[in-house]
């Protein structure tokens, strides 16, 4: 059994600068960028866990101020704590940076629950365990927040890696990754390997353990097994994709595929759960319950509220089904599927269990804003955000948690007709009505 224990994060990686300095062809993403250079400095540069987010170390300002920043593919602002807050160990002090420039503009971001607000500016930003470059980027200095920072999460800001269309206050505020690509020779691509531990980690264990890797500008072949399969990015706002079929233990949910993408389907590292539209969630839970009917769990468990506990080491993984999401492929009428295990969608919870118990929350939940493929999905896979070619790649992660009987999988091709019909066309509304609400 692979428990997902990983080596401690290397704090001082030496070595030559990354071999990513080749000029980019305008329309051409480098052929398999992972072969172009060494990504050793970026491997294992994430820490954290699905319940509280994965973060990367970044430096801001001159002299550099080091902060831990949540990696979020579901938003597009680079925003950092810039005032004292009970849950922050440190924060960005603009007055200490000689390179800070005030944009004299405020920004307010409301969530379904909670919010943050701040002041916009620019400063010099770099990623110590990333490409050897420094960029001037927009920064939202968070001066006030409610239910945004998480006690004990160890991150002080958020790196929104999605597109300008969903940036706040509007799409004229260039996101960090756009600035990075414009100002450097870093290819327009990044990849994420999020590594769930498979068991609860306390605070000190999280600090000492590896949460995964964010490879900026390329693909690292050591982080996945098998082949990468790509699905088109439907629209460049969120990382929107199209799901064409859903199976529970190989049994088709048999719903109109539009339901799976109502009103969108996105890949979002800043969300914990796999979130499904109401109708799809109800059908999926019904099917999961049926598949695991030898045991019965409380209603609150399926709502993601109550924890179910088993004596340590006796979790009956075999009674829970695998879940397969079929994604639109790059070729007409071709799809591929990604399959996750209960080891991904049952999330270990710390602090409640005794050493005699393993306790879990059901990490699939209902959504009113479409499907969200959050950390519990991403923890099964190495995910390539190939912005240059407007596609997202999935391969089985080298660090995913599994057992001796089953493993996560990425398989294809499958013949699927009329996949374009699976996309939902959202009626045009004022962008300011968008609410970001993520569990």
């Amino acid at each position: 059994t692979q428990h997902g224990i990983r080596l401690p994060l290397r704090s001082g990686l030496g070595g030559a600068p990354l071999g990513l300095r080749l000029p980019r062809e305008t329309d051409e993403e480098p052929e398999e960028p992972g072969r172009r250079g060494s990504f050793v400095e970026m491997v294992d540069n994430l820490r954290g866990k699905s319940g509280q987010g994965y973060y990367v170390e970044m430096t801001v300002g001159s002299p550099p101020q080091t902060l831990n920043i949540l990696v979020d593919t579901g938003s597009s602002n680079f925003a950092v704590g810039a005032a004292p807050h009970p849950f922050l160990h440190r924060y960005y002090q603009r007055q200490l940076s000689s390179t800070y420039r005030d944009l004299r503009k405020g920004v307010y971001v409301p969530y379904t629950q909670g919010k943050w607000e701040g002041e916009l500016g620019t400063d010099l930003v770099s990623i110590p365990h990333g490409p050897n470059v420094t960029v001037r980027a927009n920064i939202a200095a968070i001066t006030e927040s409610d239910k945004f920072f998480i006690n004990g999460s160890n991150w002080e800001g958020i790196l929104g890696l999605a597109y300008a269309e969903i940036a706040r206050p509007d799409d004229s505020l260039e996101p960090f990754f756009d600035s990075l690509v414009k100002q450097t020779h870093v290819p327009n691509l990044f990849s994420l390997q999020l590594c769930g531990a498979g068991f609860p980690l306390n605070q000190s264990e999280v600090l000492a353990s590896v949460g995964g890797s964010m490879i900026i500008g390329g693909i690292d072949h050591s982080l996945y097994t098998g082949s990468l399969w790509y699905t088109p990015i439907r629209r460049e706002w969120y990382y929107e994709v199209i799901i064409v079929r859903v199976e529970i233990n190989g049994q088709d949910l048999k719903m109109d595929c539009k339901e799976y993408n109502y009103d969108k389907s996105i890949v979002d590292s800043g969300t914990t759960n796999l979130r499904l539209p109401k109708k799809v969630f109800e059908a999926a839970v019904k099917s999961i319950k049926a598949a695991s009917s030898t045991e019965k769990f409380p209603d609150g468990f399926w709502l993601g509220e109550q924890l179910v506990c088993w004596q340590a080491g006796t979790t009956p993984w075999n009674i829970f089904p695998v879940i397969s999401l079929y994604l639109m492929g790059e070729v007409t009428n071709q799809s591929f599927r990604i399959t996750i295990l209960p080891q991904q969608y049952l999330r270990p919870v710390e602090d409640v269990a005794t050493s005699q118990d393993d306790c879990y929350k059901f990490a699939i939940s209902q959504s009113s804003t479409g499907t969200v493929m959050g950390a519990v999905i991403m923890e099964g896979f190495y995910v390539v955000f190939d912005r240059a070619r407007k596609r997202i790649g999935f391969a089985v992660s080298a660090c995913h948690v599994h057992d001796e009987f089953r493993t996560a999988a990425v398989e294809g091709p499958f013949v699927t007709l009329d996949m374009e019909d699976c996309g939902y066309n959202i009626p045009q509304t004022d962008e300011s009505t968008l609410m970001t609400g993520r569990a």
Epitope: S293, T294, K296, D299, F301, Q306, V352, C359
Partner: antibody, heavy 120, light 108 residues
Framework: QLQLQESGPGLVKPSETLSLTCTVS??????????WGWIRQPPGKGLEWIGS???????YYNPSLKSRVTISVDTSKNQFSLKLSSVTAADTAVYYC????????????WGRGTLVTVSS | EIVLTQSPATLSLSPGERATLSCRAS??????LAWYQQKPGQAPRLLIY???KRATGIPARFSGSGSGTDFTLTISSLEPEDFAVYYC??????????FGGGTKVEIK
């Protein structure tokens, strides 16, 4: 209406096995809406959960008692049973059987209880 | 492990008075908490579940409140039959197994 009734010997010798049965009447033990559980209460003390069982036979036990406890179900007789091995005086208690309802979370219906004394 | 602490251990009141019983969890149990009443020589009886919902047949004078770590059982006006021991139980972690130590409500 549904009722639960515990039965079994009131006196058990130390080191022997305590055996109790709970008979469910007025309803089916095979309902998918309930678990069935055993709880005990030493004289003058509080309540201690022993374990629970589903009609399929799936069981959950209190970790502190797990090595000594077996709970089983007989759907044909509408009964579930408790066996507690290697008993000592500390196992002297009133033993209750109960239904776990309200979203399979709370003990919403209890038997009257039976006192089991462990003594030589 | 989640520990439930009930206070006071004993509450001495007269019929007609208001009784306020407390149950504190060592960490949040959301609203997954129940209250049981146990009279001498009898089995416990479910009074309140999900912190504030009255079980079938329970008089309106019994009410539950709270969420997270602090919970209260209130008996608005004590009847003679209400003098008993009251237990809280959390089911945030399942299977249900953790009870508080009990509060005895006795006649003053």
């Amino acid at each position: 209406q549904l009722q639960l009734q515990e039965s079994g010997p009131g006196l058990v010798k130390p080191s022997e096995t305590l055996s109790l049965t709970c008979t469910v009447s007025g309803g089916s033990i095979s309902s998918s809406s309930y678990y069935w559980g055993w709880i005990r209460q030493p004289p003058g003390k509080g309540l201690e959960w022993i374990g629970s069982i589903y009609y399929s036979g799936s069981t959950y036990y209190n970790p502190s008692l797990k090595s000594r406890v077996t709970i089983s179900v007989d759907t044909s007789k509408n009964q579930f049973s408790l066996k507690l091995s290697s008993v000592t005086a500390a196992d002297t208690a009133v033993y209750y059987c109960a239904r776990v309802g309200h979203g399979i979370s709370y003990f919403d219906l209890w038997g009257r209880g039976t006192l089991v004394t462990v003594s030589s | 492990e989640i520990v439930l602490t009930q206070s006071p251990a004993t509450l001495s009141l007269s019929p007609g008075e208001r009784a306020t019983l407390s149950c504190r969890a060592s960490q949040s149990v959301s609203s997954y908490l129940a209250w049981y009443q146990q009279k001498p020589g009898q089995a416990p009886r479910l009074l309140i579940y999900d912190a504030s919902k009255r079980a079938t047949g329970i008089p309106a004078r019994f009410s539950g409140s709270g969420s997270g770590t602090d919970f209260t059982l209130t008996i608005s006006s004590l009847e003679p039959e209400d003098f008993a021991v009251y237990y809280c139980q959390q089911v945030y972690t399942w299977p249900p197994r953790t009870f508080g130590g009990g509060t005895k409500v006795e006649i003053k």
